[in-house]
């Protein structure tokens, strides 16, 4: 769920998600439209697709709470719990490390980006 994602992103990137990523660009945070603005925004767009896939699989992406371990900078998704919980963890792990990989191109000007400026084709999944 959202609490899992926030905690994981903070652990991996060192940034407070609520201040740095939710929202950011055209796809980080709730919803998403238009062409992603940069690599960080692409991370979120890919994550949206991951969640969309799980939704089609009947998973409660915002409610499901999963177990994971964070140690020595790595995330280990627990093999405990349901299929949905394990897949949800995998989606969140991927976006957390994607955001970390792209910290060097993070742009403060894209925080709280005005969504009506998000134009162009929304990438498909």
């Amino acid at each position: 769920g959202i609490l899992n994602l926030n905690k994981m992103v903070k652990q991996v990137t060192g940034k407070m998600p609520i201040l740095s990523y939710w929202p950011y660009g055209c796809h980080c945070g709730l919803g998403g439209r238009g062409q992603p603005k940069d690599a960080t925004d692409w991370c979120c767009q890919t994550h949206d697709c991951c969640y969309d896939h799980l939704k089609t699989q009947g998973c409660s992406i915002y409610k499901d709470y999963y177990r994971y371990n964070f140690s020595q900078g790595n995330i280990h998704c627990s093999d405990k719990g349901s299929w949905c919980e394990q897949q949800l963890c995998a989606c969140d792990k991927e976006v957390a490390f994607c955001l970390k990989r792209n910290l060097d191109t993070y742009q403060k000007r894209l925080r709280f980006y005005w969504r009506p400026h998000c134009r162009g084709q929304t990438p498909g999944c």
Partner: antibody, heavy 119, light 106 residues
Framework: QVTLKESGPGILQSSQTLSLTCSFS??????????VSWIRQPSGKGLEWLAH???????RYNPSLKSRLTISKDTSRNQVFLKITGVDTADTATYYC???????????WGHGTTLTVSS | QIVLTQSPAIMSASPGEKVTISCSAS?????MYWYQQKPGSSPKPWIY???NLASGVPARFSGSGSGTSYSLTIGSMEAEDAATYYC?????????FGGGTRLEIK
């Protein structure tokens, strides 16, 4: 060879607390990935998952019964316990413990212990 | 929670007849598990991950399905197959079982 055996009081009065024990052999609940579940079956009816406990003492409960259930383990004695508070006649059933492996199903089952709750 | 509905609830089949038991999920699941239970005994794992037979299960059994629709099939009914069959999911929490299908021999 994995075996599980349930034991319980057999008969209880309404409002009493049910204490069940699952004694097992052939595996260790300290081994990563191991998980023991409790499942019940009212006579002539279907199966209902109640709770499970993992090797690392993580616990999960059926949301509809969560407030009444407590699962615990004694790894050194190869036992898992289940307590159900405030039983009533609807809790009359056969109670099974089962080993859930790394997959999403229940791999080994005990023979079950029958509980009758009288009002 | 995901509700599993089995059909039919009770059925009978003649020796040699093909039998299909259905399990319908209230929302999509990734895998289905099946158990066989005979009177006075505990459930036995029968089919795991939708289509894989558990150890010792005769090859006349098969499992299939995806999404919300799954089935267990017996290619040629035998007397020893008379039992109750349950489907089960742990796609999402909590794990749930179907209500069972009682299969009798004619």
């Amino acid at each position: 060879q994995v075996t599980l055996k349930e034991s319980g009081p057999g008969i209880l009065q309404s409002s009493q607390t049910l204490s069940l024990t699952c004694s097992f052999s052939g595996f260790s609940l300290s081994t990563s990935g191991m998980c023991v579940s409790w499942i019940r079956q009212p006579s002539g009816k279907g199966l209902e998952w109640l709770a499970h406990i993992y090797w690392d003492d993580d616990k999960r409960y059926n949301p509809s019964l969560k407030s009444r259930l407590t699962i615990s383990k004694d790894t050194s004695r190869n036992q898992v316990f289940l307590k159900i508070t405030g039983v009533d006649t609807a809790d009359t059933a056969t109670y099974y413990c089962a080993l859930k492996g790394r997959d999403y199903g229940f791999d080994y089952w005990g023979h079950g212990t029958t509980l009758t709750v009288s009002s | 929670q995901i509700v599993l509905t089995q059909s039919p609830a009770i059925m009978s089949a003649s020796p040699g007849e093909k039998v299909t038991i259905s399990c319908s999920a209230s929302s999509s699941v990734s895998y289905m598990y099946w158990y066989q239970q005979k009177p006075g005994s505990s459930p036995k794992p029968w089919i795991y991950r939708t289509s894989n037979l558990a150890s010792g299960v005769p090859a006349r059994f098969s499992g299939s399905g995806s999404g919300t629709s799954y089935s267990l099939t017996i290619g040629s009914m035998e007397a020893e197959d008379a039992a109750t069959y349950y489907c089960q999911q742990y796609h999402s929490y909590p794990p749930t079982f179907g209500g069972g299908t009682r299969l009798e021999i004619k």
